[in-house]
Interface confidence: low
């Protein structure tokens, strides 16, 4: 992938629409869509103040591990729809896009260096604590959870990541 | 150990250009951002721009836009930074420093200086 | 752009503690280095993130940041700590550096 090619903001805005779509779609079918599990998540909540006063490391830890575990629940989620007979078959669609838009997402970061910032240097990984995380047992919240990290951690990173030409 | 050294002390005329070399030893060049700092005569620090070698972006203060370019040579492990359009108030010590920890983040600091270099402007 | 204040001059008698204000608008919100310059020499870093001591810096070098001013302490002061200190930020709203004015501490005697 390009290196800088995620510093040009429409890229985001597209993932960030389809992942809005998505939940829109989801929050109109019965109980939201119900996964019939709890699939472990990224908590997405940004304490500005924090993350301010925090290391880019550590951003950049948030946001590679949180990528990881969404893209790990994406799959658990297409593989849990693959043997559902009572969840309708356009909802596949949208997890598929999200499935590929993660991937993309995914190798668009790595050109940008963020997996070698988050966990280089060595003291920036000892000393995180631990990813916060939270569970979706809906479509609905999971799609709700992929947009919101997406608008937010995800945007945070690459505009700090952008604007210093880091890569 | 890292070091950082300028080069050596330069008068020019006004309207000229002057260019500042940092050759950086000790530690990963690519890896921190360099930033040049000015100090005229009896006064205080004032930060020019800075760049980050990795990906050549280099961020200029706005006072110096337009008039300033900072370069890196990553084969030669050396910062440049040349100065345009030159008048007598840009007389001044020029001083090249490296970031450490996250280059162009609220958690970099300037960690290691070079020395200085004089330029005088002068007609 | 951002404004860090730091008052011109600062005395203190061999001895006794030295307290060198920086202030700046929600100032806790950055974090705040520290630098001592000497005539002649280029700036040494002293304290960095608000509080930390870089290797070689003496315990009596401190920094707090709270409210609207930081603030850089050194207990028993000694007359080769006579020099220019300056707060730095990092603004992230422009993405620049930027310096307080420098504060010069003289030691009396």
């Known amino acids: 992938a390009p290196a800088r090619l995620i510093c040009d903001s429409r890229v985001l805005e597209r993932y960030i629409l389809e992942a809005k779509e998505a939940e829109n779609v989801t929050m109109g079918c019965a109980e939201g869509c119900s996964l019939g599990e709890n699939i472990t998540v990224p908590d997405t909540k940004v304490n500005f103040h924090h993350w301010k006063k925090s290391e880019a490391g550590r951003h950049a830890v948030e946001v590679w591990q949180g990528l990881a575990l969404l893209s790990e629940a994406m799959l658990r989620s297409q593989a849990l729809l693959a043997n559902s007979s009572q969840l309708p078959e356009t909802l596949q669609v949208h997890v598929d896009k999200a499935v590929s838009g993660l991937r993309s997402l995914t190798s668009l970061l790595r050109a940008l260096g963020v997996q070698k910032e988050a966990v280089s240097p060595p003291e920036a990984a000892s000393s995180a604590a631990p990813l916060r995380t939270v569970a979706a047992d809906t479509l609905c919240k999971l799609f709700r959870i992929y947009s919101n990290f997406l608008r937010g951690k995800l945007k945070l990173y690459t505009g700090e990541a952008c604007r210093r030409g880091d890569r | 150990q890292v070091q950082l050294v300028q080069s050596g002390a330069e008068v020019k005329k006004p309207g000229s250009s002057v260019k500042v070399s940092c050759k950086a030893s000790g530690g990963t060049f690519r890896s921190y951002a360099i930033s040049w700092v000015r100090q005229a005569p009896g006064q205080g620090l004032e930060w020019m721009g800075g760049i980050d070698p990795i990906s050549g972006f280099a961020d200029y203060a706005q006072k110096f836009q337009g008039r300033v370019t900072i370069t890196a040579d990553e084969s030669t492990s050396t910062a440049y930074m040349e100065l345009s359009s030159l008048r007598s108030e840009d007389t001044a010590v020029y001083y090249c420093?490296?970031?450490?920890?996250?280059?162009?983040?609220?958690?970099?600091?300037?960690?290691?200086w070079g020395r200085g270099t004089l330029v005088t402007v002068s007609s | 752009s951002y404004v860090l204040t730091q008052p011109p001059s600062v005395s203190v008698a061999p001895g006794k503690t030295a307290r060198i204000t920086c202030s700046g608008d929600n100032i806790p919100e950055y974090y705040v280095h520290w630098y001592q310059q000497k005539p002649g020499q280029a700036p040494v870093l002293v304290i960095y993130r608000d509080n930390e001591r870089p290797s070689g810096i003496p315990e009596r070098f401190s920094g707090s940041n709270s409210g609207n001013t930081a603030t850089l302490t050194i207990s028993r002061v000694e007359a080769g700590d006579e020099a220019d200190y300056y707060c730095q930020v990092f603004d992230e709203s422009s993405w620049h550096w930027v310096f307080g004015g420098g504060t010069k501490l003289t030691v009396l005697g």
């Open positions: 420093a490296r970031e450490l920890y996250y280059p162009g983040t609220w958690m970099a600091v300037m960690a290691y």
